[in-house]
């Protein structure tokens, strides 16, 4: 055979997003000779791994290899064989694994070790599996959406094709909602970032950015629901929890052991006189909203202003892209349109939550009941988080753009992560020749 088939003039990269509720594999592609240009990397495939998040495999680590097989095989099909050995593979685990690590560093390490061994068995250039920080998750999400929107580019050719046209180079803020955490990241206007933990400095394509970011662990939609249930069951008079965040007629039995399994509910934990309780939906948006607000401690703020729980938040500035579960939930509820005001969103949520469970099941027969039952809570939670948590108003609501994909690539942290690890975001404006690696961030 010939001495290594001449490589295609394109390159590929794989990033696995090991989230709290599931794992997704993303395949990216870019022209080899344009590595340092902005906007040239695009997503060619997303493969959702069947099953839960990797943190759920803590008692069955031997099943991780099989769990990852289908999507890794899909990657082998999509990427030309001649490129496999040169294709980097990265796995980043987010808040689900952060929570597991809080419970047991040993168990988290064991899961990651098996993940690493499984992924290294494939014929790719496996570069490691790690738990990324909340700060990284926020930063890479911000990089992704601004890269895809052409905000780092000086070339005006972009502005005829990107959505959310703003005709300027002002970056978008990033709002990311997962199952176990939520991130807010943006460039504040001439504002000192009072908390060093929330400050990031980037130099990208010759421009400096002072970025604010924070990740709220336990405030992803799934963990927020567990928190709310743990809080509300404290004051229930018996093993029936009448819950305004579920549709009228909805019933579900919850094990107390499951409720207290997560570190997110520890602050509400108490000895209950029962092992199980039953959620009975009453479907009332206003009451649900009020219950959710009790999860946000706004009574304490050591800074000029805070989001909640004493976390500094500068005044909101500019447009925001809201993605991941912000998008999925609002898309299901048909509330992603730019034309829908915050008041209209609230009205629609009131109507949706009040609909009887039997009616909802009939209307959305193709949707799994587990997910379907939680849209009332999730939609209400999103409104509560954005309005009371982050201080968006009816007026600034129009600056939130619910984004699934930009130019065919999913909005999320994975693209930014890969761009950084493959040194594809130069600190300076690229010259006609590629820069040495020493100039990268």
């Amino acid at each position: 055979t010939q001495n290594k088939a001449l490589p295609e003039n394109v390159k590929y990269g794989i990033v696995l997003d090991a989230g709290s509720s599931h794992t997704s594999l993303y395949i990216y592609k870019w022209p080899a000779e344009k590595e340092n240009d902005t906007g040239v990397v695009h997503q060619v495939e997303e493969c959702r791994v069947k099953g839960p998040g990797i943190s759920k495999f803590v008692q069955k680590v031997n099943e991780i290899g099989i769990y990852l097989t289908d999507c890794m095989e899909r990657a082998r099909e999509v990427i030309p064989r001649s490129q496999h050995q040169e294709t980097p593979v990265y796995l980043g685990a987010t808040a689900g694994m952060r929570l597991l690590r809080m419970e047991s560093e040993e168990l988290a390490d064991r899961v990651l070790d098996v993940v690493e061994r499984s992924l290294s068995n494939y014929p790719f250039d496996f570069q490691g599996a790690r738990i990324i920080t909340g700060q990284e998750e926020g930063a890479y999400g911000w990089i992704t959406i601004n890269y895809l929107l052409g905000k780092f580019s000086q070339k005006t050719r972009w502005f005829s094709i990107v959505p959310y046209e703003t005709n300027n180079q002002e970056t978008f803020g990033a709002l990311d909602l997962g199952g176990a955490s939520t991130q807010v990241t943006f460039v504040p206007q001439n504002q000192t970032i009072e908390s060093p933990d929330n400050a990031l400095q980037f130099r990208l394509y010759g421009k400096d950015y002072n970025v604010y970011t924070h990740s709220f662990l336990c405030y992803g939609k799934d963990q927020a629901l567990w928190q709310k249930l743990a809080k509300d069951i404290q004051v229930a008079s018996n093993e029936i929890l009448r819950d305004p965040c579920f549709h009228p007629g909805y019933k579900k039995v919850v094990n107390v052991s499951d409720l207290y399994k997560t570190p997110c509910t520890k602050r509400f934990e108490m000895t209950l006189p029962f092992q199980q309780f039953e959620i009975q939906g009453i479907g009332n948006y206003q009451q649900c909203h009020q219950s959710i607000l009790e999860l946000f401690n706004t009574s304490y703020c050591p800074y000029s202003q805070c989001a909640f729980n004493g976390i500094f938040l500068p005044p909101l500035q500019g447009d925001f892209g809201a993605f991941s579960a912000f998008y999925f939930v609002m898309k299901f509820l048909n509330l992603t349109s730019e034309k829908v005001s915050q008041e209209k969103v609230t009205e629609m949520m009131k109507k949706f939550c009040a609909q009887p469970w039997e009616e909802i099941k009939t209307s959305y027969a193709g949707v799994k009941e587990k997910y379907l039952s939680e849209y009332c809570f999730s939609g209400t939670y999103i409104l509560s988080l954005l309005l009371q948590g982050y201080h968006f108003t009816a007026d600034s609501w129009e600056h939130i753009h619910f984004i699934g994909k930009i130019q065919g690539s999913d909005a999320g942290w994975t693209l930014g992560y890969m761009l950084n690890l493959t040194n594809m975001i130069p600190a300076e404006q690229p010259l006609s020749t590629p820069l040495s690696h020493s100039t990268y961030v």
């Epitope: 010939q2 001495n3 064989r81 001649s82 050995q85 068995n121 014929p123 250039d125 496996f126």
Partner: antibody, heavy 121, light 107 residues
């Protein structure tokens, strides 16, 4: 000319150790995954293990039958592949081939001439 | 691990005959199947890679086919120098595994 030349074989007692070497020439050694394959007398071929590149942190994979006893390493500056064999058993008696694939992966288009390892008391 | 089974173990043919050697994988390996020829006292030689891809320098009478679990190596007209042992190999996933071999002998 692309060439792989194994050395270091010989007679060793059960429980003993041996280190095989494979000198590569005619190609850019550091750019290719390298493998060891063995063949017992009158038997079929058995893959022993592989070592990947520096960029892959010199990752290794082994057949279950040798895991924990054999170690593959490489010295890219010397264009040499190694197989350190410890706790040898009689069933490790075989001709050991150093192999690589100069095109794509996980097949072997370049083979050494082999070196014989005999484990016997 | 993926088990590779070759049949028959021995095949007796006359020069000029058409020969088909079989290889079966215990699970689907797509087209990640490779064929080798080994003559006494020599190292194996790659004949076919990825089930059907021919190699420069290998006579055109050697061809491969198959996908999934069933594969064949065909020699359209056996020459005297083709009498040897033929091995198939799983190149899909680790551990890499070989079939037990088929010995092609003169009738």
């Amino acid at each position: 000319e692309v060439q792989l030349v194994e050395s270091g074989g010989g007679l060793v007692k059960p429980g003993g150790s041996l280190r095989l070497s494979c000198a590569a020439s005619g190609f850019t050694f550091s750019k290719y995954w390298m493998n060891w394959v063995r063949q017992s007398p009158g038997k079929g071929l058995e893959w022993v293990g592989e070592i990947r590149l520096k960029s892959n942190k010199y990752g290794t994979h082994y057949a279950e039958s040798v895991k924990g006893r054999f170690t593959i390493s490489r010295d890219d500056s010397k264009n040499t592949l190694y197989l350190q064999m410890n706790s040898l058993k009689t069933e490790d008696t075989a001709v050991y081939y150093c192999t690589t694939q100069l095109d794509l992966y996980w097949f072997f288009d370049v083979w050494g001439q082999g070196t014989t390892v005999t484990v016997s008391s | 691990e993926i088990v590779m089974t070759q049949s028959p173990a021995t095949l007796s043919v006359s020069p000029g005959e058409r020969v088909t050697l079989s290889c079966r994988a215990s699970q689907s390996i797509s087209d990640y199947l490779h064929w080798y020829q080994q003559k006494p006292g020599q190292s194996p030689r790659l004949l076919i890679y990825y089930a059907s891809q021919s190699i420069s320098g290998i006579p055109a009478r050697f061809s491969g086919s198959g996908s999934g679990t069933d594969f064949t190596l065909t020699i359209s007209s056996v020459e005297p120098e083709d009498f040897a042992v033929y091995f198939c190999q799983n190149g899909h996933s680790l551990p890499l595994t070989f079939g037990g071999g088929t010995k092609l002998e003169i009738k």
